[in-house]
Interface confidence: low
């Protein structure tokens, strides 16, 4: 059968029918339904929601909907032994204690099972000592402290403000600096936008609000006890001492009211420059320790959380493809939340629910996609992307042979200013073409396309007249699909104006105040931005599953490969003498990129001309497109990060959220001037250039004519 026969109606009509079926009112209703109680991973409430979603997806018309369960390591506070931080005097008396939980938002005072703020996977401990303020606890912040200011964090408790980088990287940096505890806090400079009221009167963080979150350094491993393999009934589990990525020092998060009490007494060195100052009325002294009158006082942490192997549940729905059922397009987002999940994740889950409903409606009318669509409601994302990673580990052989694309669907909004897209270069043209067909929801852009408003508000730094599309990093459920398995991936959401709002994420992220009312009152009362995100995510899935030729353009990969090669070369050229001394050449990489560009161009010409009515040739060309992303996977992985296997992209070693290009070379060059053995260090740079050049060349050859 041809695609059109199999799918009953013409592709254009299909897409329009699918998009027209998506309704803002339904997304609103689903969001309300998903946010009335907490859905913490591993709890009964989240299991019940999984069963509800399973039941509703079946009603919507999917062919099958199954629960996939795993027993993974999670972390919870001790219910009768709360975590807190105190200031103690010379007699050991506690003269100040931090809050034990956030004041509940209006209307939620009687809700049970609100987990108090904690840093998931913190070890237990009661360290006491002097405080050192370490700014954002980034690599460069510790360089400033240790190298420029000669401040030693060894044996100290450090206090770091949230923002800029993933919290797990902050903790790792603090550990490496010798700290014995970490206090994380939200500074108003990063989580309180000027001119906006705090919740419940606006979308800003109140002083008692606290960001929860895991502090793991998993590097893509999934469940810390079963790296590489699913945490199933017969799993062999590592001992806790061998678990992947667990922090070794106690960590706890606080709000800015409590932070004020700790920071106002700080003495020692003044902040090195204005970039170390937040917005609290405190000196932002670095320490160590408290000033004059308070110099005998210390800080003590009281952390009693426990790590427990707990059952989690993914919901996996299938809509079988009519023509290529063995080709999978996956739409996945998580279901578990820290508390109510008003934005993270339920604004995304509600959109997925409506996309499933729309696809189901078309199916009931006799339509099927060309390729199989898998829908996933992942569990335990907040605890380290565990649900998605375990499922991908269990199904890795199927996915690496059959996976066409993965579209992520966490939070649909982090603002209401413009679209934000991160994806593989293979999807650039798909995203451009789709957004040109969608209406912009933005004020002042009535009757204009989404592409137009997006390009105006978020222009590409390289190409005029085009919107910015960012690299994929991590911190979300696409990680295993893209970074480990090499499946083309993308994500889209509505975001804030990064120019005017320099706070990190959105202010109420992972707090108790992330409620339905936050979204309905302040972010998207008409749910028009949610609808637009549903159209983008759903439209991408539709095209990927239904277009006869896969909507991937390999020429866009060629363009970025050249850009990334130029960038890494310019970083290396900061050390011209060493490059000369150690004979470091990038010729092989530039040659490989040139070959890739030429071969991709020829492939694209053949793609225009081949006989699409020949199913064998069609499948062959589509397979070359599908497997191109796979060709960038190095089975040996990156140094010390075996589950990050993509040679072109990896999460930054200094910030899990950010993507780094040619990460192997980048990490080899990083801080190379401080390495004790320069010959060995530059040898590793040369090896990484070799790996990158080989991989690009090998990927290019997958696009050559097959015989």
């Amino acid at each position: 059968k041809s695609s059109n026969e199999a799918t009953n109606i013409t592709p254009k009509h299909n897409m329009k029918a699918f998009l027209d079926e998506l309704k803002a009112e339904n997304i609103k209703k689903f969001l309300y339904n998903f946010t009335q109680i907490p859905h913490l991973a591993g709890t009964e409430q989240n299991f019940q929601l999984a069963k509800q979603i399973q039941s509703q997806w079946k009603e919507f018309g999917l062919d099958s909907v199954e629960l996939a369960h795993y027993d993974v390591l999670l972390s919870y506070p001790n219910k009768t032994h709360p975590n807190y931080i105190s200031i103690i005097n010379e007699d050991g008396n506690e003269i100040f204690n931090t809050s034990l939980f956030e004041p509940p938002p209006p209307g939620y005072e009687n809700v049970s099972d609100i987990v108090p703020p904690f840093s998931a996977f913190s070890p237990q401990g009661m360290p006491e000592g002097d405080l050192v303020y370490v700014n954002y606890a980034r690599t460069e912040d510790f360089f400033k402290l240790e190298r420029d200011m000669k401040i030693n964090c060894s044996g100290k408790i450090v206090i770091a403000r949230y923002g800029k980088v993933f919290r797990g990287n902050k903790v790792k940096n603090a550990q490496l600096a010798g700290a014995k505890g970490v206090i994380l806090y939200s500074d108003p400079a990063d989580y309180f936008a000027p001119g906006v009221k705090s919740y419940p009167d606006g979308w800003n963080l109140p002083g008692g609000g606290v960001q929860r979150g895991n502090i793991l350094n998993l590097n893509g491993a999934g469940d810390p006890l079963t790296p590489g393999y699913p945490a199933n009934e017969y799993a062999y589990r590592r001992g806790i001492a061998e678990a992947v990525g667990l922090p070794s020092i106690p960590v706890h998060p606080i709000g800015y009211y409590d932070a004020q009490k700790l920071l106002e007494k700080m003495g020692g060195s003044a902040p090195p420059d204005s970039s170390w100052r937040g917005s609290l009325k405190v000196p932002y002294n670095v320490g160590p320790g408290f000033t004059g009158n308070f110099s005998t006082q210390k800080v003590k942490m009281h952390i009693h959380s426990t790590n427990e192997v707990t059952r989690i549940y993914n919901v996996i729905g299938t809509l079988r493809g009519a023509v290529e059922p063995d080709r999978y397009v996956i739409l996945g987002g998580h279901r578990d939340s820290w508390v109510f999940g008003g934005i993270d994740p339920q604004s995304g889950a509600a959109v997925v629910h409506e996309i499933v409903r729309s696809f189901g409606t078309l199916k009931k009318e006799g339509w099927r996609p060309r390729r199989t669509i898998l829908f996933a409601s992942w569990d335990a994302e907040e605890f380290g992307l565990l649900g998605s990673t375990e499922w991908a580990e269990e199904n890795s052989r199927l996915l690496q042979e059959r996976g066409v694309a993965y579209i992520n669907a966490d939070s649909s909004i982090e603002g209401n200013y413009t679209l934000r897209v991160d994806c593989t270069p293979l999807m650039y043209s798909l995203v451009h073409n789709l957004t040109k067909e969608l209406k912009s929801p933005d004020e002042g852009f009535e009757g204009k396309s989404l592409y137009e408003s997006w390009t105006k508000k978020s222009p590409s730094p390289e190409f005029s007249g085009m919107p910015r599309i960012s690299k994929l990093g991590s911190g979300n459920d696409f990680e295993v699909f893209f970074q480990r398995l090499g499946i083309a991936s993308g994500r889209a959401r509505y975001t804030k104006n990064w120019e005017t709002n320099k706070f990190s994420g959105y202010p109420l992220y992972h707090s108790v105040y992330e409620t339905y009312e936050l979204v309905e009152k302040f972010y998207d009362p008409m749910f028009k931005y949610h609808l637009t995100v549903a159209q983008v995510r759903g439209g991408m899935v539709f095209e990927l599953a239904n277009s006869i030729v896969l909507p991937f353009d390999c020429r866009d990969y060629a363009v970025v490969l050249r850009k990334y090669a130029d960038k890494i070369y310019s970083i290396s050229m900061k050390h011209p003498q060493e490059m000369k001394t150690y004979s470091v050449s990038f010729d092989s990489l530039f040659s490989a990129v040139k070959n890739f560009t030429e071969i991709a161009s020829k492939f694209s010409e053949r793609l225009q001309d081949f006989d699409k009515s020949n199913p064998i040739v069609l499948r062959m060309m589509n397979d070359q497109l599908m497997f191109l992303e796979r060709a960038f996977i190095d089975p040996l992985g990156l140094p010390d990060r075996p589950f990050y296997r993509h040679v072109i992209y990896a999460p930054s070693s200094h910030n899990k959220y950010a993507g780094e290009s040619f990460p192997g070379i980048y990490d080899a060059l990083f801080d190379i001037e401080s390495k004790v053995d320069p010959s060995k260090a530059w040898g590793e740079v040369k090896r990484q250039i070799y790996v990158a050049a080989f991989t690009v060349q090998a990927a290019a050859e997958t696009l050559s004519e097959v015989a």
């Epitope: 709360p82 100040f96 034990l100």
Partner: nanobody
Framework: EVQLVESGGGVVQPGRSLRLSCAAS????????MHWVRQAPGKGLEWVAI????????YYTDSVKGRFTISRDNSKNTLYLQMNSLRVEDTAVYYC?????????WGQGTTVTVSS
């Protein structure tokens, strides 16, 4: 000298209410979290409720949730425990304690007997 003095205990029937008070002196009351602990006859200490220094955060053991309310009046240096729907098993000596677990200063206790 740091002192905590509990009051308000007594004998009540099941289902009735009592309000315990704890007067604090000798330290800066509004800098400290406080808690109530109880000891039933012949049993060990059982933690009952905690309140943060500013009164914003409250924590209860499962057996008293929804029945007991911890509160404080920082202007009066006083901690309270409102006990509603009392049960026979709530019979104990109730102590208030300064700081959070494990506490450094305890009161002398006030006895609550719930009996029909």
């Amino acid at each position: 000298e740091v002192q905590l003095v509990e009051s308000g205990g007594g004998v009540v029937q099941p289902g009735r209410s009592l309000r315990l008070s704890c007067a604090a002196s000798g330290f800066t009351f509004n800098n400290y979290g406080m808690h109530w602990v109880r000891q039933a006859p012949g049993k060990g200490l059982e933690w009952v409720a905690i309140i943060s220094y500013d009164g914003n955060s409250k924590y209860y053991t499962d057996s008293v949730k929804g029945r007991f309310t911890i509160s404080r009046d920082n202007s009066k240096n006083t901690l309270y425990l409102q006990m509603n729907s009392l049960r026979v098993e709530d019979t104990a000596v109730y102590y208030c304690a300064k700081g959070l677990w494990p506490s450094d200063v305890w009161g002398q206790g006030t006895t609550v007997t719930v009996s029909s």
